[in-house]
């Protein structure tokens, strides 16, 4: 788990683009806000993440959805699918 | 499963310079997006200090930007990383990356040693 800290001068995401590329995995946790995550999960699949930059955003969304994803969320999860285990599949109510 | 080679790392004292190379093995290289990390020790993350377009358009890391150039020569398949003005903390292994979503394939590295 990514050490909580606080985000750097400017480095607070306004929206979720490839700048995040550069962002190393703790100003990810600590710049990226998770409820804007969630509205623009579109774009993660179209941005060029390492593997472990993914397992932030996952973090993020896991925080927020304690009790398992929305659907908005789980139609756009792309490359983060990987990422999901078994448990986090079964908390997902699906229609 | 696309093979990238890296080249070019040693031990350079501090001030000094090195050219790193990441030859590919894809024919359609020159539609790639590629980048070039560098990882400081084992199990640490992996850090992206500069990106280069299919236009040659480039991006660096805050940490690099003036001091660190990246070029590309798309009928050698390679890209390339000039690092001027060396620092003990750019020591690490340089990996290069085609900056594909999905893609999280690694070459070797290429080590790169800073002594002060």
């Known amino acids: 788990e990514v050490e909580k800290t606080a985000c750097p001068s400017g480095k607070k995401a306004p929206e979720i683009d490839e700048s995040l590329i550069f962002y190393k995995k703790w100003e990810l946790e600590a710049c990226v806000d998770a409820a804007l995550l969630a509205t623009q999960m579109d774009r993660v699949n179209a941005i060029p993440f390492t593997y472990e930059q993914l397992d932030v955003l996952k973090h993020k969304l896991d925080e927020l959805y304690p009790q398992g994803y929305p659907e908005s969320v789980i139609q756009h999860l792309g490359y983060l699918f990987l990422k999901m285990s078994p448990e986090d599949i079964r908390k997902w109510n699906v229609t | 499963q696309v093979q990238l080679v890296e080249s070019g790392g040693g031990l350079v004292q501090a001030g000094g310079s090195l050219r790193l190379s990441c030859t590919a093995s894809?024919?359609?290289?020159?539609?790639?997006?590629m980048g070039w990390y560098r990882q400081e020790a084992p199990g640490k993350e992996r850090e992206l200090v500069a990106?280069?377009?299919?236009?040659?358009?480039?991006n660096y890391a805050d940490s690099v930007k003036g001091r660190f150039t990246i070029s590309r020569d798309n009928a050698k398949n390679t890209v390339y990383l000039q690092m001027n003005s060396l620092k003990s903390e750019d020591t690490g292994v340089y990996y290069c990356?085609?900056?594909?979503?999905?893609?999280?394939?690694w070459g070797q590295g290429t080590q790169v040693t800073v002594s002060s």
């Open positions: 990356r085609i900056m594909r979503p999905g893609n999280w394939y």
């Open positions: 990106t280069i377009n299919r236009f040659g358009s480039t």
């Open positions: 894809e024919s359609g290289f020159s539609a790639n997006y």
